[in-house]
Amino acid sequence: DSSKWVFEHPETLYAWEGACVWIPCTYRALDGDLESFILFHNPEYNKNTSKFDGTRLYESTKDGKVPSEQKRVQFLGDKNKNCTLSIHPVHLNDSGQLGLRMESKTEKWMERIHLNVSERPFPPHIQLPPEIQESQEVTLTCLLNFSCYGYPIQLQWLLEGVPMRQAAVTSTSLTIKSVFTRSELKFSPQWSHHGKIVTCQLQDADGKFLSNDTVQLNVKHTPKLEIKVTPSDAIVREGDSVTMTCEVSSSNPEYTTVSWLKDGTSLKKQNTFTLNLREVTKDQSGKYCCQVSNDVGPGRSEEVFLQVQYAPEPSTVQILHSPAVEGSQVEFLCMSLANPLPTNYTWYHNGKEMQGRTEEKVHIPKILPWHAGTYSCVAENILGTGQRGPGAELDVQYPPKKVTTVIQNPMPIREGDTVTLSCNYNSSNPSVTRYEWKPHGAWEEPSLGVLKIQNVGWDNTTIACAACNSWCSWASPVALNVQYAPRDVRVRKIKPLSEIHSGNSVSLQCDFSSSHPKEVQFFWEKNGRLLGKESQLNFDSISPEDAGSYSCWVNNSIGQTASKAWTLEVLYAPRRLRVSMSPGDQVMEGKSATLTCESDANPPVSHYTWFDWNNQSLPYHSQKLRLEPVKVQHSGAYWCQGTNSVGKGRSPLSTLTVYYSPETIGRR
């Protein structure tokens, strides 16, 4: 309606004696500015006077001055928009209607506001969500329809009379729409909060109690249970009986079902609050709890760990690691189910007790071949001693041990024999798979670990073998000690150092490079004739007749070896010279006569000289002197001389007779 003034403010305001009231208010006049304002208490319109009667709490004048007695009430507004009011302090008799009489130049308006002032501070109001469940966060709200700038208040939350630790968020509203103070508390209730009293307490600025509101919490929760066990420590021996009782300490709403669980799995046909276990076995050891359900869900008790004690079971041995390499470390672990845990262990190796080993683990820092075998153990606890289990096998791997090269042949071995050797070893793990031989040769291996040397050489000195599995172990080399006839027999001239001249002292040595066995005999021969049995052949004064082809033989028990033929050469001056005549020593004149100087010399004669009966040298230097035609005056005695590098020799005289031919005689 356009003929109305427009006001906005809370419909009713609430306060209590001695507090204050703050009235937020806005308006819009029909025309112009506000010229007059009167605040009435319970105004009533007087038709006769056409004016409002009632107590005037506040009155403004045109000059804007306010009488001093009106200071309790303050108009905080203005001439065109704001009509906010404050009453401080407010009194009980201020309750009722407040009338705001507004006048402009041409228009008038009466606006009514309800004021409710109580004798004492009124309580706030707690608002709860429709349902509260344990552990789910909820917001508790405490609302008080009061706020006034001049009268500070606070709202505090209490649980069972004790201030709550959670931080509350307080907010105030002083608007034309609403006036209130609100405190909000975020809270995660637990099942134990069910039935507890929550209080919102109104306090003044000094913390003095003014009023409060209380509610009882209805926290929906799963059943809360307590489990009781007999015996109380839940430790029993096999064959004993155990009773467990489930008590519901709280449930909201009421519980509907009950069940029992062992190690998280439901036990069938156990739906009462008592669980009776008769003559328990070790398999019944475990974690027990009871479960009770309601509409919220299932609730579980704490777990009871039932320990059924028993003597150790037959033990098993775990080996870290098998197979083990010799020299490595190995750990043995004795495993035996027992309750309580075993306190003592007895260890066995191949059935024999291992002294001093009383712990769950046995550590061997350096494994040796004889550590191999079966390891077993016995565990012991307060209830008894377990049985020895089957044990575990430790396999110790190592290179072949005590490898030897063995000669299979009868001794001695002779050059050219076929030699068989075997490679032997004492033990090996894993088994030997191959063999190696040193030195390498084109030899035959007829079977594993056997070597055959055909036609063994005199110089095959030592052989070594290795037996190999994952590793190779070498034997010490074995000497074949091959026996052979003397080798490299040769004749060597010891003296003279230079060439041999007739008359020299001569020594020949029979040399050889090696012989096995070392004991030897010597033989010298010339032209098949035995000359001596020493290593040396000596000539005190060599003669040309000693020249020739010499051999020496060296023999041992295996055989004999001859040297190559060695030629002995004796150097001598020409000897045994003679002049031979051809066709004879009597030649007819006119014929041909040849004189030859024959000699024995080494080296051969290199130069000849011919002499006549007068010892006159003739101008001829070859071996033959040819007279052609021969004359009677050539008759006479001739001799020759031969020369070589060693010396000279001369022949005796030889006479040539030249006789007259029949023609010459005929002429005479």
């Epitope: 470390q329 190796h349 024999k352 291992m354 002294q355 001093g356 080993r357 009383t358 712990e359 046995v362 550590h363 061997i364 820092p365 350096k366 040796l368 004889w370 550590h371």
Partner: antibody, heavy 117, light 106 residues
């Protein structure tokens, strides 16, 4: 490198108690047993007792009442205590490591103890 | 307790000769026997363990044999440095030393 060092008094009076300490390095007392051995001057070696890896002990029956062997694995130390010492106990005392199935291959220089008033 | 008896107490030999030392146990010791060499002023030195296994670095002239109760240490050809006292040790059941054999130069 395995090392053993025996230490203790050089001279002990008759009736007194001898305490010798063996400090080891290069191996752990949780892996090796330790035996104590002695040798009087000019006489044979005599085994006194052993402390096993697990801490158990065994003693030479002739000396059992007088001997105690203990150890501290963390300190790598073994202690021999011998009560009521007599001049015949004058000897060189050795601590020696060994383990199951293996003889003693590491010997320290030993410590010579003389019992005299 | 196991008792070990060594024989002879003294053995007089020349370098190059063969030495045979004996050790007899009062019961079967399952080959768990070791042999030690000791020279004056020195700690014992392990030669052989587990009856016949030569310790690393021990010359091949030293060898061990035996089983059950009877065990032997053999030195195939004596060297001058081999003259010393030799002890056997059983480690089958606790530990026991023999009384020793003195090997001296003849």
């Amino acid at each position: 490198e395995v090392q053993l060092k025996e230490s203790g008094p050089v001279l002990v009076k008759p009736t007194e108690t001898l305490t010798l300490t063996c400090t080891v390095s290069g191996f752990s007392l949780t892996s090796y047993d330790i035996s104590w051995i002695r040798q009087p001057p000019g006489k044979a070696l005599e085994w006194l007792g052993v402390i096993w890896t697990g801490g158990g002990t065994n003693y030479n029956s002739a000396l059992k009442s007088r001997l105690t062997i203990s150890k501290d694995n963390s300190k790598s130390q073994v202690v021999l205590t011998m009560t009521n010492m007599d001049p015949v106990d004058t000897a060189t005392y050795y601590c020696v490591p060994h383990y199951y199935g293996y003889a003693m291959d590491y010997w320290g220089q030993g410590t010579t103890v003389t019992v005299s008033s | 307790e196991i008792v070990l008896t060594q024989s002879p107490a003294t053995l007089s030999l020349s370098p190059g000769e063969r030495a045979t030392l004996s050790c007899r146990a009062s019961q079967d010791i399952n080959k768990y026997i070791a042999w030690y060499q000791q020279k004056p002023g020195q700690a014992p030195r392990l030669l052989i363990h587990y009856t016949s296994t030569r310790q690393t670095g021990i010359p091949a002239r030293f060898s061990g044999s035996g089983s059950g109760r009877d065990y032997t240490l053999t030195i195939s050809s004596l060297e001058p440095e081999d003259f010393a006292v030799y002890y056997c040790l059983q480690y089958d059941n606790l530990l026991t030393f023999g009384g020793g054999t003195k090997l001296e130069i003849k």
